[in-house]
Amino acid sequence: KLLQVSTIAMQQQEKLIQQERALLNFTEWKRSCALQMKYCQAFMQNSLSSAHNSSPCPNNWIQNRESCYYVSEIWSIWHTSQENCLKEGSTLLQIESKEEMDFITGSLRKIKGSYDYWVGLSQDGHSGRWLWQDGSSPSPGLLPAERSQSANQVCGYVKSNSLLSSNCSTWKYFICEKYALRSSV
């Protein structure tokens, strides 16, 4: 009888592990979808514009290498910021390198004073890991400098030349990013 109970418990445990694995796979799939969508949008934009001689970035967007950036003039909470960027065929800024960070902070200094700008960085509620919107982890030099004391979800923002963290429900400006169009020449 005891052996039977033990076997059932082991089977349940195995089932639970499989479900957890499936959930983890689904989460990873969801993250990769966001990245694929970003690439897909960029590809479509490049394809559609190849017939015309258009500038690499839309009006009011700033270009740096292969990227176009939009510095918002409106406040949003983090999730709405992401929605705003998506409507423009872009995503919240993902900072890949110190060079990109320097370009962004340098541009912000020229455009505006020392304001807060949401970027596409959020903290996973369970693991506490920082993740970009595509599911990748920021490089060690690009982790938010201070850990927010908020019990709510925590997201990353840029201020002056620092990457910081705050409750995702606070209102801030935001920065969108998309791929620059390839020249059709």
């Epitope: 918002s72 409106i74 909470i77 709405t80 705003n84 409507k87 209102w171 969108c176």
Partner: nanobody, 116 residues
């Protein structure tokens, strides 16, 4: 095409109050974050306040914090701006619009003049 209509402005004394209202034709405001802006003569349009679509979250520019209150009535499809302790520097045309990158065509605005 959507039309934003602002109302409630007027000429008041410093320290007085006014309540501005914003309505939209042919568009349901309840699904949008909404914002109030103002533009003084010879100056750029500036952000005043913003309210979330549900109305449970608001944010204000430093120069109006504690004096102005943004609210909304989703049943009536309106957004309001209660302005208390008005100052001469609040004199401007006030406009409402959706709080998104691509905004709707601007309305005529409503003029607020605060005399000292």
């Amino acid at each position: 095409d959507v039309q934003l209509v602002e109302s409630g402005g007027g000429l008041v004394q410093a320290g007085d109050s006014l309540r501005l209202s914003c309505a939209a034709s042919e568009r349901n405001l309840r699904i949008y974050d909404m914002a109030w802006y103002r533009q003084a003569p010879g100056k750029e349009r500036e952000y005043v306040a913003v309210i979330s679509s549900s109305g449970d979250s608001t944010h204000y520019s430093d120069f109006v914090k504690g004096r102005f209150t943004i609210s909304r009535d989703n049943a009536k499809n309106t957004v309001s701006l209660q302005m208390d302790s008005l100052k001469p520097e609040d004199t401007a045309f006030y406009y409402c619009n959706v709080n998104q990158i691509r905004q709707w065509p601007w309305g005529q605005g409503t003029q607020v003049t605060v005399s000292s």
